[in-house]
Protein backbone atom coordinates (compact mmCIF):
# COMPACT_ATOMS: atom_id res chain seq x y z
CA UNK A 1 0.00 0.00 0.00
CA UNK A 2 0.84 3.69 0.31
CA UNK A 3 3.06 3.18 3.34
CA UNK A 4 5.25 0.75 1.44
CA UNK A 5 5.53 3.20 -1.45
CA UNK A 6 6.34 6.03 0.97
CA UNK A 7 8.99 3.87 2.55
CA UNK A 8 10.48 3.03 -0.87
CA UNK A 9 10.41 6.66 -1.96
CA UNK A 10 12.07 7.79 1.25
CA UNK A 11 14.78 5.23 0.69
CA UNK A 12 15.31 6.07 -2.99
CA UNK A 13 15.49 9.87 -2.64
CA UNK A 14 18.32 9.78 -0.10
CA UNK A 15 21.52 11.17 -1.57
CA UNK A 16 23.84 8.24 -1.07
CA UNK A 17 25.49 5.61 -3.25
CA UNK A 18 23.00 3.11 -4.66
CA UNK A 19 19.83 5.21 -4.77
CA UNK A 20 18.01 6.42 -7.93
CA UNK A 21 18.27 9.96 -6.66
CA UNK A 22 22.03 9.79 -6.13
CA UNK A 23 22.74 8.40 -9.61
CA UNK A 24 20.81 11.22 -11.30
CA UNK A 25 22.06 13.79 -8.84
CA UNK A 26 25.78 13.17 -9.43
CA UNK A 27 25.36 13.49 -13.20
CA UNK A 28 22.04 14.69 -14.52
CA UNK A 29 20.40 12.29 -16.95
CA UNK A 30 18.61 15.23 -18.54
CA UNK A 31 20.10 17.21 -21.40
CA UNK A 32 20.26 20.81 -20.31
CA UNK A 33 20.51 23.63 -22.84
CA UNK A 34 21.17 27.29 -22.31
CA UNK A 35 19.84 29.52 -25.06
CA UNK A 36 21.06 33.10 -25.35
CA UNK A 37 19.40 36.06 -27.01
CA UNK A 38 21.69 39.06 -27.42
CA UNK A 39 20.33 42.60 -27.43
CA UNK A 40 21.92 44.21 -30.48
CA UNK A 41 21.97 48.00 -30.09
CA UNK A 42 20.68 49.71 -33.24
CA UNK A 43 21.51 53.35 -32.47
CA UNK A 44 24.79 53.56 -30.52
CA UNK A 45 25.77 57.03 -31.77
CA UNK A 46 22.42 58.64 -31.01
CA UNK A 47 22.52 57.27 -27.48
CA UNK A 48 26.07 58.45 -26.86
CA UNK A 49 25.61 61.89 -28.40
CA UNK A 50 21.99 62.71 -27.53
CA UNK A 51 21.10 60.39 -24.65
CA UNK A 52 18.35 58.89 -26.84
CA UNK A 53 16.40 55.82 -25.88
CA UNK A 54 18.43 52.69 -26.61
CA UNK A 55 16.90 50.75 -29.50
CA UNK A 56 17.56 47.05 -29.14
CA UNK A 57 16.81 44.08 -31.34
CA UNK A 58 17.16 40.64 -29.82
CA UNK A 59 19.12 38.08 -31.83
CA UNK A 60 19.04 34.41 -31.00
CA UNK A 61 18.78 31.75 -29.90
CA UNK A 62 22.44 30.80 -29.62
CA UNK A 63 22.39 27.49 -27.83
CA UNK A 64 24.92 25.74 -25.60
CA UNK A 65 24.77 22.40 -23.90
CA UNK A 66 25.44 22.88 -20.18
CA UNK A 67 25.42 20.91 -16.93
CA UNK A 68 26.76 17.79 -18.65
CA UNK A 69 29.64 17.35 -16.19
CA UNK A 70 29.33 15.15 -13.12
CA UNK A 71 29.60 16.72 -9.70
CA UNK A 72 33.15 16.67 -8.35
CA UNK A 73 34.72 16.07 -4.94
CA UNK A 74 31.54 14.35 -3.73
CA UNK A 75 32.12 13.70 -0.02
CA UNK A 76 29.68 12.22 2.46
CA UNK A 77 29.80 13.34 6.09
CA UNK A 78 28.19 10.66 8.27
CA UNK A 79 28.31 12.84 11.36
CA UNK A 80 25.98 15.58 10.14
CA UNK A 81 24.32 13.61 7.31
CA UNK A 82 25.47 15.91 4.57
CA UNK A 83 27.15 15.49 1.23
CA UNK A 84 29.43 18.15 -0.21
CA UNK A 85 30.37 18.71 -3.84
CA UNK A 86 31.52 21.09 -6.55
CA UNK A 87 29.37 21.67 -9.62
CA UNK A 88 31.76 22.05 -12.59
CA UNK A 89 30.87 24.50 -15.34
CA UNK A 90 31.07 23.65 -19.00
CA UNK A 91 29.39 24.89 -22.17
CA UNK A 92 29.44 23.38 -25.66
CA UNK A 93 28.07 25.37 -28.57
CA UNK A 94 25.27 23.66 -30.50
CA UNK A 95 25.27 25.08 -34.07
CA UNK A 96 22.20 23.08 -35.13
CA UNK A 97 20.14 24.70 -32.35
CA UNK A 98 21.44 28.21 -33.05
CA UNK A 99 20.61 30.96 -35.54
CA UNK A 100 24.25 31.69 -36.27
CA UNK A 101 27.79 31.04 -35.10
CA UNK A 102 29.89 32.09 -32.13
CA UNK A 103 31.63 34.50 -34.52
CA UNK A 104 28.47 36.57 -35.07
CA UNK A 105 28.97 40.26 -34.22
CA UNK A 106 26.83 42.37 -31.90
CA UNK A 107 26.80 46.02 -30.92
CA UNK A 108 26.61 46.05 -27.14
CA UNK A 109 27.45 48.32 -24.25
CA UNK A 110 31.18 48.54 -23.57
CA UNK A 111 31.30 46.42 -20.42
CA UNK A 112 34.68 47.72 -19.26
CA UNK A 113 33.82 51.40 -19.74
CA UNK A 114 30.50 51.05 -17.91
CA UNK A 115 32.02 49.02 -15.07
CA UNK A 116 35.17 51.10 -14.58
CA UNK A 117 33.26 54.38 -14.52
CA UNK A 118 30.99 52.90 -11.84
CA UNK A 119 33.73 51.33 -9.71
CA UNK A 120 36.11 54.30 -9.85
CA UNK A 121 33.91 57.27 -9.00
CA UNK A 122 36.70 59.60 -7.93
CA UNK A 123 36.74 62.54 -10.35
CA UNK A 124 40.50 62.57 -10.84
CA UNK A 125 40.59 58.81 -11.41
CA UNK A 126 37.78 59.23 -13.95
CA UNK A 127 39.96 61.72 -15.84
CA UNK A 128 42.69 59.12 -15.90
CA UNK A 129 40.17 56.54 -17.13
CA UNK A 130 38.97 59.02 -19.75
CA UNK A 131 42.49 59.35 -21.09
CA UNK A 132 42.84 55.56 -21.31
CA UNK A 133 39.42 55.08 -22.90
CA UNK A 134 40.31 57.63 -25.56
CA UNK A 135 43.83 56.31 -26.04
CA UNK A 136 42.47 52.80 -26.60
CA UNK A 137 39.83 54.16 -29.03
CA UNK A 138 37.12 52.68 -26.83
CA UNK A 139 33.60 54.08 -26.74
CA UNK A 140 30.31 53.70 -24.89
CA UNK A 141 29.38 50.83 -27.20
CA UNK A 142 31.51 48.17 -28.84
CA UNK A 143 31.20 45.45 -31.44
CA UNK A 144 31.95 41.99 -30.08
CA UNK A 145 31.47 38.41 -31.23
CA UNK A 146 29.17 36.11 -29.30
CA UNK A 147 32.16 34.10 -28.09
CA UNK A 148 33.91 37.24 -26.83
CA UNK A 149 30.83 38.64 -25.14
CA UNK A 150 30.01 35.44 -23.27
CA UNK A 151 33.34 33.84 -22.57
CA UNK A 152 35.81 36.72 -22.54
CA UNK A 153 38.08 39.01 -24.54
CA UNK A 154 41.10 41.14 -23.77
CA UNK A 155 39.80 44.67 -23.37
CA UNK A 156 41.97 47.35 -25.01
CA UNK A 157 41.05 50.03 -22.47
CA UNK A 158 41.69 47.84 -19.42
CA UNK A 159 44.98 46.75 -20.96
CA UNK A 160 46.18 50.35 -20.55
CA UNK A 161 44.94 50.82 -16.98
CA UNK A 162 47.94 51.39 -14.70
CA UNK A 163 46.18 49.65 -11.81
CA UNK A 164 46.60 45.90 -11.42
CA UNK A 165 43.23 44.95 -12.97
CA UNK A 166 42.00 41.87 -14.83
CA UNK A 167 42.15 42.83 -18.49
CA UNK A 168 39.88 40.01 -19.70
CA UNK A 169 36.18 40.80 -19.74
CA UNK A 170 33.17 38.61 -20.51
CA UNK A 171 29.69 38.21 -19.08
CA UNK A 172 30.43 34.64 -18.01
CA UNK A 173 34.22 34.87 -17.81
CA UNK A 174 35.72 32.68 -16.45
CA UNK A 175 33.38 29.73 -17.11
CA UNK A 176 34.83 26.58 -18.69
CA UNK A 177 37.18 24.78 -16.28
CA UNK A 178 35.63 26.50 -13.27
CA UNK A 179 33.20 25.12 -10.69
CA UNK A 180 30.40 26.45 -8.52
CA UNK A 181 30.54 25.68 -4.81
CA UNK A 182 31.51 24.03 -2.54
CA UNK A 183 27.91 23.10 -1.76
CA UNK A 184 27.13 21.06 1.33
CA UNK A 185 23.60 19.63 1.29
CA UNK A 186 21.65 17.34 3.57
CA UNK A 187 21.61 13.78 2.26
CA UNK A 188 18.27 12.96 3.94
CA UNK A 189 19.50 9.88 5.79
CA UNK A 190 18.34 11.07 9.18
CA UNK A 191 15.48 13.29 8.03
CA UNK A 192 14.06 12.89 4.54
CA UNK A 193 12.28 16.25 4.75
CA UNK A 194 15.70 17.91 4.61
CA UNK A 195 17.08 16.04 1.60
CA UNK A 196 18.91 18.25 -0.93
CA UNK A 197 18.48 21.34 1.25
CA UNK A 198 21.66 23.37 1.28
CA UNK A 199 23.42 23.46 4.63
CA UNK A 200 26.32 25.67 3.54
CA UNK A 201 27.60 27.31 0.35
CA UNK A 202 31.31 28.07 0.15
CA UNK A 203 31.49 27.10 3.80
CA UNK A 204 28.88 29.61 4.99
CA UNK A 205 25.17 29.70 5.76
CA UNK A 206 24.83 33.20 4.42
CA UNK A 207 26.13 35.08 1.39
CA UNK A 208 27.52 38.36 2.77
CA UNK A 209 25.91 40.27 -0.14
CA UNK A 210 22.67 41.36 1.47
CA UNK A 211 21.31 42.54 4.81
CA UNK A 212 19.09 40.51 7.12
CA UNK A 213 17.05 37.54 5.81
CA UNK A 214 17.88 38.39 2.17
CA UNK A 215 21.38 37.09 2.82
CA UNK A 216 20.27 33.61 3.80
CA UNK A 217 20.89 30.49 1.71
CA UNK A 218 17.47 28.88 1.64
CA UNK A 219 16.21 25.59 0.26
CA UNK A 220 17.78 23.42 -2.41
CA UNK A 221 19.50 24.20 -5.72
CA UNK A 222 16.11 23.62 -7.48
CA UNK A 223 17.20 20.35 -9.14
CA UNK A 224 15.12 18.53 -6.54
CA UNK A 225 13.14 19.17 -3.38
CA UNK A 226 12.28 17.01 -0.39
CA UNK A 227 9.64 14.40 -1.38
CA UNK A 228 5.86 14.62 -1.00
CA UNK A 229 5.53 18.15 -2.30
CA UNK A 230 2.23 19.89 -1.53
CA UNK A 231 0.56 22.48 -3.76
CA UNK A 232 0.34 24.84 -0.81
CA UNK A 233 4.11 24.85 -0.31
CA UNK A 234 6.39 27.74 -1.11
CA UNK A 235 9.49 26.12 -2.57
CA UNK A 236 12.67 27.93 -1.60
CA UNK A 237 15.85 27.54 -3.63
CA UNK A 238 19.22 29.20 -4.02
CA UNK A 239 20.62 30.31 -7.36
CA UNK A 240 24.27 31.31 -7.49
CA UNK A 241 23.60 32.92 -10.91
CA UNK A 242 21.51 35.61 -9.25
CA UNK A 243 23.42 35.61 -5.95
CA UNK A 244 20.34 35.06 -3.85
CA UNK A 245 17.72 32.65 -2.62
CA UNK A 246 14.29 32.92 -4.21
CA UNK A 247 11.04 30.97 -4.16
CA UNK A 248 8.40 29.42 -6.39
CA UNK A 249 4.66 28.90 -5.84
CA UNK A 250 2.24 26.39 -7.32
CA UNK A 251 0.56 27.45 -10.55
CA UNK A 252 -1.01 24.41 -12.23
CA UNK A 253 -1.11 20.66 -12.75
CA UNK A 254 0.78 19.58 -15.86
CA UNK A 255 1.08 16.22 -17.56
CA UNK A 256 4.69 15.68 -18.59
CA UNK A 257 5.14 12.62 -20.80
CA UNK A 258 2.44 10.82 -18.87
CA UNK A 259 3.80 11.88 -15.47
CA UNK A 260 1.62 14.19 -13.36
CA UNK A 261 3.76 17.11 -12.21
CA UNK A 262 3.16 20.36 -10.36
CA UNK A 263 4.18 23.50 -12.16
CA UNK A 264 5.75 25.96 -9.74
CA UNK A 265 6.53 29.48 -10.97
CA UNK A 266 8.47 32.46 -9.68
CA UNK A 267 5.72 34.94 -8.83
CA UNK A 268 5.85 38.63 -9.72
CA UNK A 269 5.76 39.30 -5.95
CA UNK A 270 9.32 37.94 -5.70
CA UNK A 271 10.45 40.84 -7.90
CA UNK A 272 8.27 43.51 -6.31
CA UNK A 273 9.53 46.65 -4.61
CA UNK A 274 9.51 46.82 -0.80
CA UNK A 275 6.49 49.12 -1.13
CA UNK A 276 4.46 46.18 -2.46
CA UNK A 277 6.39 43.35 -0.78
CA UNK A 278 8.03 44.54 2.46
CA UNK A 279 10.10 41.31 2.63
CA UNK A 280 12.14 42.63 -0.28
CA UNK A 281 13.45 45.68 1.60
CA UNK A 282 16.88 44.10 2.00
CA UNK A 283 17.28 43.54 -1.74
CA UNK A 284 17.18 47.30 -2.21
CA UNK A 285 20.80 48.28 -1.69
CA UNK A 286 20.88 51.89 -2.88
CA UNK A 287 18.42 54.75 -3.17
CA UNK A 288 19.22 56.58 -6.42
CA UNK A 289 18.86 53.99 -9.18
CA UNK A 290 16.00 52.33 -7.29
CA UNK A 291 14.23 55.69 -6.93
CA UNK A 292 14.12 55.32 -3.17
CA UNK A 293 13.31 51.61 -3.42
CA UNK A 294 10.17 52.18 -5.49
CA UNK A 295 11.55 50.64 -8.71
CA UNK A 296 11.05 46.92 -9.07
CA UNK A 297 11.94 43.98 -11.27
CA UNK A 298 15.71 44.50 -11.29
CA UNK A 299 18.21 43.21 -8.76
CA UNK A 300 21.51 45.00 -8.16
CA UNK A 301 24.06 42.18 -7.73
CA UNK A 302 27.14 44.43 -7.91
CA UNK A 303 28.31 43.27 -4.47
CA UNK A 304 28.43 39.76 -5.83
CA UNK A 305 30.24 40.86 -9.00
CA UNK A 306 33.27 42.68 -7.51
CA UNK A 307 31.54 46.04 -7.75
CA UNK A 308 30.65 45.76 -11.43
CA UNK A 309 27.18 47.31 -11.88
CA UNK A 310 25.37 44.12 -12.93
CA UNK A 311 21.59 44.07 -12.62
CA UNK A 312 19.59 40.86 -13.00
CA UNK A 313 16.01 40.90 -14.22
CA UNK A 314 13.57 38.68 -16.02
CA UNK A 315 13.85 38.78 -19.83
CA UNK A 316 12.56 41.92 -21.52
CA UNK A 317 12.09 43.41 -18.03
CA UNK A 318 9.08 41.21 -17.33
CA UNK A 319 7.54 42.22 -13.96
CA UNK A 320 9.73 45.35 -13.86
CA UNK A 321 8.57 48.90 -13.20
CA UNK A 322 7.95 51.17 -16.21
CA UNK A 323 10.84 53.49 -15.29
CA UNK A 324 13.29 50.62 -15.82
CA UNK A 325 12.25 49.82 -19.38
CA UNK A 326 11.31 53.39 -20.38
CA UNK A 327 14.77 54.27 -21.82
CA UNK A 328 14.90 51.02 -23.83
CA UNK A 329 12.96 50.52 -27.08
CA UNK A 330 12.32 47.12 -28.62
CA UNK A 331 11.35 45.06 -25.57
CA UNK A 332 8.24 42.84 -25.55
CA UNK A 333 7.83 41.04 -22.23
CA UNK A 334 5.40 38.15 -22.00
CA UNK A 335 4.91 35.63 -19.23
CA UNK A 336 4.83 32.52 -21.39
CA UNK A 337 8.27 33.11 -22.88
CA UNK A 338 10.00 35.00 -20.12
CA UNK A 339 9.01 33.63 -16.73
CA UNK A 340 10.81 30.87 -14.84
CA UNK A 341 9.03 27.64 -13.97
CA UNK A 342 9.84 24.26 -12.40
CA UNK A 343 7.82 21.12 -13.13
CA UNK A 344 8.14 18.98 -10.02
CA UNK A 345 7.05 15.39 -9.61
CA UNK A 346 5.42 15.72 -6.18
CA UNK A 347 6.08 12.24 -4.79
CA UNK A 348 9.85 12.26 -5.27
CA UNK A 349 10.33 16.03 -5.31
CA UNK A 350 12.42 15.70 -8.49
CA UNK A 351 12.38 18.58 -10.97
CA UNK A 352 11.60 16.77 -14.23
CA UNK A 353 11.37 19.86 -16.42
CA UNK A 354 12.37 23.45 -15.92
CA UNK A 355 12.91 26.73 -17.71
CA UNK A 356 15.14 29.19 -15.93
CA UNK A 357 14.98 32.60 -17.59
CA UNK A 358 16.97 35.63 -16.65
CA UNK A 359 18.40 38.77 -18.20
CA UNK A 360 21.82 40.29 -17.61
CA UNK A 361 21.89 44.09 -17.59
CA UNK A 362 24.59 46.64 -16.90
CA UNK A 363 24.13 50.07 -15.40
CA UNK A 364 25.74 52.98 -17.22
CA UNK A 365 25.68 56.47 -15.76
CA UNK A 366 26.58 59.91 -17.06
CA UNK A 367 30.12 60.99 -16.20
CA UNK A 368 31.34 64.55 -16.49
CA UNK A 369 34.94 63.36 -16.70
CA UNK A 370 34.55 60.54 -19.23
CA UNK A 371 33.90 61.98 -22.64
CA UNK A 372 32.11 58.97 -24.11
CA UNK A 373 29.59 59.13 -21.22
CA UNK A 374 29.47 62.89 -20.92
CA UNK A 375 26.40 63.56 -23.05
CA UNK A 376 24.21 61.10 -21.17
CA UNK A 377 21.37 62.85 -19.36
CA UNK A 378 20.15 59.84 -17.39
CA UNK A 379 21.07 56.46 -16.00
CA UNK A 380 20.43 53.42 -18.15
CA UNK A 381 20.05 49.82 -17.04
CA UNK A 382 21.16 48.37 -20.37
CA UNK A 383 20.00 44.86 -21.34
CA UNK A 384 22.93 42.85 -22.70
CA UNK A 385 21.35 39.42 -23.12
CA UNK A 386 18.74 37.10 -21.79
CA UNK A 387 18.99 33.36 -21.36
CA UNK A 388 16.68 30.41 -21.20
CA UNK A 389 18.13 27.37 -19.48
CA UNK A 390 15.92 24.35 -20.01
CA UNK A 391 15.91 20.67 -19.21
CA UNK A 392 13.27 18.00 -19.76
CA UNK A 393 13.33 14.39 -18.68
CA UNK A 394 14.11 12.11 -21.65
CA UNK A 395 11.49 9.69 -23.02
CA UNK A 396 13.35 6.62 -21.79
CA UNK A 397 13.80 8.06 -18.31
CA UNK A 398 10.14 9.14 -18.29
CA UNK A 399 9.02 5.58 -19.09
CA UNK A 400 11.20 4.25 -16.30
CA UNK A 401 9.91 6.90 -13.92
CA UNK A 402 6.29 6.11 -14.81
CA UNK A 403 6.74 2.40 -14.25
CA UNK A 404 8.77 2.70 -11.06
CA UNK A 405 7.07 5.62 -9.34
CA UNK A 406 3.83 7.08 -10.62
CA UNK A 407 2.56 3.82 -12.15
CA UNK A 408 2.84 2.05 -8.82
CA UNK A 409 0.84 4.72 -7.06
CA UNK A 410 -1.89 5.06 -9.65
Amino acid sequence: GDLLIQKTIKKQVVLEEGTIAFKNWVKTGTEVYRQFWIFDVQNPQEVMMNSSNIQVKQRGPYTYRVRFLAKENVTQDAEDNTVSFLQPNGAIFEPSLSVGTEADNFTVLNLAVAAASHIYQNQFVQMILNSLINKSKSSMFQVRTLRELLWGYRDPFLSLVPYPVTTTVGLFYPYNNTADGVYKVFNGKDNISKVAIIDTYKGKRNLSYWESHCDMINGTDAASFPPFVEKSQVLQFFSSDICRSIYAVFESDVNLKGIPVYRFVLPSKAFASPVENPDNYCFCTEKIISKNCTSYGVLDISKCKEGRPVYISLPHFLYASPDVSEPIDGLNPNEEEHRTYLDIEPITGFTLQFAKRLQVNLLVKPSEKIQVLKNLKRNYIVPILWLNETGTIGDEKANMFRSQVTGKIN
Partner: antibody
Framework: QVQLQQPGTELVKPGASVKLSCKAS????????MHWVKQRPGQGLEWIGE????????NYNQKFKGKATLTVDKSSSTAYMQLSSLTSEDSAVYYC?????????WGQGTTLTVSS | DIVLTQSQKFMSTSVGDRVSVTCKAS??????VAWYQQKPGQSPKALIY???YRYSGVPDRFTGSGSGTDFTLTISNVQSEDLAEYFC?????????FGGGTKLEIK
Protein backbone atom coordinates in the same frame (compact mmCIF):
# COMPACT_ATOMS: atom_id res chain seq x y z
CA GLN B 1 56.09 62.00 -27.70
CA VAL B 2 53.84 64.29 -25.64
CA GLN B 3 55.05 67.90 -25.76
CA LEU B 4 53.66 71.02 -24.13
CA GLN B 5 55.07 74.32 -25.28
CA GLN B 6 54.71 77.23 -22.88
CA PRO B 7 56.37 80.64 -23.29
CA GLY B 8 59.29 80.94 -20.88
CA THR B 9 58.44 84.35 -19.39
CA GLU B 10 55.77 87.02 -19.35
CA LEU B 11 56.27 90.46 -17.82
CA VAL B 12 53.10 92.48 -17.13
CA LYS B 13 52.06 95.53 -15.14
CA PRO B 14 49.85 95.40 -12.03
CA GLY B 15 46.14 95.69 -12.82
CA ALA B 16 46.61 94.32 -16.34
CA SER B 17 45.57 90.91 -17.73
CA VAL B 18 47.63 88.21 -19.38
CA LYS B 19 46.75 85.17 -21.47
CA LEU B 20 49.17 82.29 -20.98
CA SER B 21 49.31 79.65 -23.70
CA CYS B 22 50.09 75.95 -23.74
CA LYS B 23 50.44 74.33 -27.16
CA ALA B 24 50.05 70.56 -27.10
CA SER B 25 51.43 68.03 -29.54
CA UNK B 26 52.11 64.30 -29.69
CA UNK B 27 48.64 63.27 -28.55
CA UNK B 28 44.95 63.88 -29.32
CA UNK B 29 44.38 67.24 -27.68
CA UNK B 30 40.61 66.85 -27.20
CA UNK B 31 40.94 63.47 -25.47
CA UNK B 32 42.57 64.64 -22.26
CA UNK B 33 41.56 67.10 -19.57
CA MET B 34 44.07 69.93 -19.15
CA HIS B 35 45.03 71.17 -15.70
CA TRP B 36 46.78 74.35 -14.63
CA VAL B 37 49.00 74.59 -11.56
CA LYS B 38 50.64 77.63 -9.90
CA GLN B 39 54.00 77.63 -8.13
CA ARG B 40 55.28 80.72 -6.39
CA PRO B 41 59.07 81.09 -6.02
CA GLY B 42 60.34 78.81 -3.29
CA GLN B 43 56.78 77.73 -2.45
CA GLY B 44 54.48 74.79 -2.99
CA LEU B 45 52.06 73.96 -5.78
CA GLU B 46 48.47 75.18 -6.10
CA TRP B 47 45.86 73.63 -8.35
CA ILE B 48 44.01 76.31 -10.34
CA GLY B 49 41.51 74.34 -12.38
CA GLU B 50 40.84 72.00 -15.27
CA UNK B 51 39.24 72.13 -18.71
CA UNK B 52 37.92 69.44 -21.03
CA UNK B 53 39.14 70.50 -24.51
CA UNK B 54 36.40 68.49 -26.22
CA UNK B 55 33.63 70.81 -25.01
CA UNK B 56 35.37 73.48 -22.89
CA UNK B 57 33.78 72.27 -19.66
CA UNK B 58 35.69 73.73 -16.69
CA ASN B 59 36.12 73.23 -12.95
CA TYR B 60 37.95 75.81 -10.85
CA ASN B 61 39.53 75.97 -7.46
CA GLN B 62 37.22 78.44 -5.70
CA LYS B 63 40.26 80.52 -4.77
CA PHE B 64 40.99 81.25 -8.46
CA LYS B 65 37.42 81.90 -9.61
CA GLY B 66 37.31 85.40 -11.08
CA LYS B 67 41.09 85.44 -11.32
CA ALA B 68 41.66 82.67 -13.88
CA THR B 69 39.68 81.81 -17.02
CA LEU B 70 40.49 78.61 -18.88
CA THR B 71 39.82 78.26 -22.61
CA VAL B 72 41.00 76.13 -25.53
CA ASP B 73 41.45 76.48 -29.26
CA LYS B 74 40.89 73.02 -30.70
CA SER B 75 42.09 73.98 -34.17
CA SER B 76 45.58 74.79 -32.90
CA SER B 77 45.57 72.28 -29.98
CA THR B 78 46.27 75.12 -27.57
CA ALA B 79 45.02 75.67 -24.04
CA TYR B 80 44.90 79.16 -22.57
CA MET B 81 44.65 80.62 -19.10
CA GLN B 82 43.74 84.27 -18.77
CA LEU B 83 44.69 85.93 -15.48
CA SER B 84 43.04 89.26 -14.71
CA SER B 85 43.60 92.18 -12.31
CA LEU B 86 47.16 91.12 -11.74
CA THR B 87 49.04 91.86 -8.54
CA SER B 88 52.46 90.86 -7.27
CA GLU B 89 50.74 87.86 -5.63
CA ASP B 90 50.20 86.47 -9.12
CA SER B 91 53.92 86.40 -9.85
CA ALA B 92 54.66 82.68 -10.17
CA VAL B 93 55.44 79.85 -12.53
CA TYR B 94 52.30 78.48 -14.20
CA TYR B 95 52.27 74.90 -15.48
CA CYS B 96 49.82 73.22 -17.83
CA UNK B 97 49.44 69.45 -17.53
CA UNK B 98 47.16 67.11 -19.48
CA UNK B 99 45.73 64.26 -17.45
CA UNK B 100 47.02 61.07 -18.91
CA UNK B 101 47.15 58.78 -16.06
CA UNK B 102 48.18 61.49 -13.66
CA UNK B 103 49.98 64.80 -13.91
CA UNK B 104 53.03 63.10 -15.38
CA UNK B 105 53.40 65.25 -18.50
CA TRP B 106 53.88 68.81 -17.35
CA GLY B 107 54.78 71.79 -19.49
CA GLN B 108 58.04 73.55 -18.65
CA GLY B 109 56.02 76.38 -17.15
CA THR B 110 55.69 80.10 -17.84
CA THR B 111 57.27 82.46 -15.35
CA LEU B 112 54.90 85.39 -14.90
CA THR B 113 56.33 88.54 -13.36
CA VAL B 114 53.95 91.29 -12.30
CA SER B 115 55.88 94.50 -11.86
CA SER B 116 55.51 98.17 -12.62
CA ASP C 1 39.89 72.41 1.64
CA ILE C 2 41.98 69.37 2.55
CA VAL C 3 45.34 70.39 3.96
CA LEU C 4 48.35 68.14 3.32
CA THR C 5 51.17 68.62 5.80
CA GLN C 6 54.72 67.57 5.00
CA SER C 7 56.20 68.29 8.40
CA GLN C 8 59.83 68.01 7.34
CA LYS C 9 60.77 70.83 4.99
CA PHE C 10 64.31 69.48 4.58
CA MET C 11 65.80 66.03 4.89
CA SER C 12 69.45 65.16 4.66
CA THR C 13 70.63 61.73 3.56
CA SER C 14 73.61 59.96 2.03
CA VAL C 15 73.92 57.96 -1.18
CA GLY C 16 72.86 54.35 -0.52
CA ASP C 17 70.70 55.29 2.48
CA ARG C 18 66.96 54.79 2.89
CA VAL C 19 64.78 57.83 3.53
CA SER C 20 61.05 58.26 4.22
CA VAL C 21 59.10 61.40 3.33
CA THR C 22 55.79 61.73 5.15
CA CYS C 23 52.54 63.48 4.32
CA LYS C 24 49.52 63.90 6.61
CA ALA C 25 46.05 64.80 5.36
CA SER C 26 43.63 66.88 7.44
CA UNK C 27 40.86 64.39 6.61
CA UNK C 28 40.45 60.92 5.14
CA UNK C 29 41.46 60.84 1.47
CA UNK C 30 41.40 57.07 1.02
CA UNK C 31 44.28 56.15 -1.28
CA UNK C 32 43.73 59.09 -3.60
CA VAL C 33 47.24 60.44 -3.20
CA ALA C 34 50.06 61.03 -5.69
CA TRP C 35 53.73 61.87 -5.17
CA TYR C 36 55.80 64.19 -7.39
CA GLN C 37 59.50 64.86 -7.72
CA GLN C 38 60.72 68.32 -8.73
CA LYS C 39 64.38 68.76 -9.49
CA PRO C 40 65.88 72.29 -9.34
CA GLY C 41 64.82 74.36 -12.39
CA GLN C 42 62.52 71.63 -13.76
CA SER C 43 58.79 70.97 -13.82
CA PRO C 44 57.39 68.31 -11.46
CA LYS C 45 57.42 64.66 -12.47
CA ALA C 46 54.87 62.12 -11.22
CA LEU C 47 56.29 59.15 -9.30
CA ILE C 48 53.39 57.45 -7.51
CA TYR C 49 49.60 57.35 -7.93
CA UNK C 50 46.89 55.86 -5.72
CA UNK C 51 49.24 56.04 -2.75
CA UNK C 52 51.32 53.00 -3.70
CA TYR C 53 51.48 52.44 -7.46
CA ARG C 54 54.57 53.49 -9.39
CA TYR C 55 54.28 55.16 -12.78
CA SER C 56 56.00 53.28 -15.57
CA GLY C 57 59.64 54.20 -15.84
CA VAL C 58 59.96 55.14 -12.17
CA PRO C 59 62.79 53.20 -10.48
CA ASP C 60 61.59 50.61 -7.99
CA ARG C 61 63.60 52.22 -5.21
CA PHE C 62 60.62 54.62 -4.92
CA THR C 63 57.81 53.11 -2.86
CA GLY C 64 54.54 54.71 -1.72
CA SER C 65 52.42 53.53 1.17
CA GLY C 66 49.57 54.60 3.41
CA SER C 67 45.83 55.25 3.29
CA GLY C 68 43.33 57.46 5.05
CA THR C 69 45.36 60.34 6.47
CA ASP C 70 48.97 59.14 6.67
CA PHE C 71 51.17 58.60 3.63
CA THR C 72 54.83 57.85 3.10
CA LEU C 73 57.18 57.98 0.15
CA THR C 74 60.22 55.79 0.79
CA ILE C 75 63.39 56.02 -1.27
CA SER C 76 65.67 53.08 -0.65
CA ASN C 77 69.27 53.09 -1.85
CA VAL C 78 69.23 56.87 -2.43
CA GLN C 79 71.11 58.03 -5.54
CA SER C 80 72.65 61.44 -6.17
CA GLU C 81 70.04 62.10 -8.90
CA ASP C 82 67.32 61.88 -6.24
CA LEU C 83 68.33 65.36 -5.03
CA ALA C 84 64.97 67.10 -5.44
CA GLU C 85 61.87 68.40 -3.72
CA TYR C 86 59.06 65.90 -3.17
CA PHE C 87 55.39 66.88 -3.06
CA CYS C 88 52.33 64.86 -2.15
CA UNK C 89 48.96 65.65 -3.73
CA UNK C 90 45.43 64.56 -2.83
CA UNK C 91 42.80 64.11 -5.51
CA UNK C 92 40.08 62.80 -3.25
CA UNK C 93 38.04 65.98 -3.46
CA UNK C 94 38.03 69.44 -5.01
CA UNK C 95 40.08 71.51 -4.91
CA UNK C 96 43.03 69.19 -5.42
CA UNK C 97 45.72 70.22 -2.98
CA PHE C 98 49.46 69.67 -2.62
CA GLY C 99 51.70 69.31 0.39
CA GLY C 100 54.24 72.06 1.07
CA GLY C 101 57.11 69.89 -0.17
CA THR C 102 60.14 68.19 1.36
CA LYS C 103 63.59 69.00 0.00
CA LEU C 104 65.98 66.08 -0.06
CA GLU C 105 69.63 67.03 0.34
CA ILE C 106 72.45 64.60 -0.36
CA LYS C 107 75.31 64.82 2.14
Amino acid sequence: QVQLQQPGTELVKPGASVKLSCKASGYTFTSYWMHWVKQRPGQGLEWIGEIDPSDSHTNYNQKFKGKATLTVDKSSSTAYMQLSSLTSEDSAVYYCAPIYYGLDNWGQGTTLTVSS
Amino acid sequence: DIVLTQSQKFMSTSVGDRVSVTCKASQNVGTNVAWYQQKPGQSPKALIYSASYRYSGVPDRFTGSGSGTDFTLTISNVQSEDLAEYFCQQYNSYPYTFGGGTKLEIK
